[in-house]
């Protein structure tokens, strides 16, 4: 919605459900439609409260 898109490597159509491939230390952020630096997902002992364990199958469009 009005975003300028200047970089091809890390873009996808907003309607696409398949994220662009990112570098190993990055992940795809649907909000900004770019690959960004990504931290390791929190493990249970560091405080996640969801019943979905890290590594559980996840639809690509569920990025948040």
């Amino acid at each position: 919605m009005g975003a300028r898109r200047l970089r091809v490597r890390s873009q996808r159509s907003r309607d696409s459900s398949v994220p662009t491939q990112c570098n190993q230390t990055e992940c795809f952020d649907p909000l900004v439609r770019n690959c960004v630096s990504c931290e390791l997902f929190h493990t249970p002992d560091t405080g996640h409260t969801s019943s979905l364990e890290p590594g559980t199958a996840l639809q690509p469009q569920e990025g948040s």
Partner: antibody
Amino acid sequence: EVQLVESGGGLVQPGGSLRLSCAASGFTISSNSIHWVRQAPGKGLEWVAWVTPSGGSTDYADSVKGRFTISADTSKNTAYLQMNSLRAEDTAVYYCARRVCYNRLGVCAGGMDYWGQGTLVTVSS
Amino acid sequence: DIQMTQSPSSLSASVGDRVTITCRASQDVSTAVAWYQQKPGKAPKLLIYSASFLYSGVPSRFSGSGSGTDFTLTISSLQPEDFATYYCQQSRISPPTFGQGTKVEIK
């Protein structure tokens, strides 16, 4: 230690301009999207703009589109918000914030984890 | 743009109470919702990301749930330091949008 420090706020007349700065330390802004969020006196949070310095992509709230420009200088590890044609309704505390991402099977799960202290912009004659 | 509607806009509660705040998105945002706490004159603080994941250092009395369009922030036992305003935010599609806020006041 991650820190964001805003500066550049102040009193400006309607139609005037200001440039806000957001100096980051403890991380490189080329890795994360940087957002500006504002809060008018006694009101809620309103997202203003984001920039991804590494990719140069930007987006704006409709209320500021065409008047505000977000940018970043990775060599100075600083993001900016150039505000032109200011209106009384732009009066607010302006915060910059970093969006953190955690890797969920290659997709970002995250939120705005570090915020600056805020800088007050007052538009009045 | 996606609208985020929070309810209630304010509530009065006592220390030890269980408090629930809801947020409804105008369209499906999957689990792309974060919750923030803000105290007067201070910047917001991230509590929950991805609808249900507790951010580092946030007390475990805070929890989040939901997906799609309906989301909930729960404080299991309200503490004195929890009296503040709480905001939800969706980050599924730009522009990211905030709810209007819920002010939690002392009864």
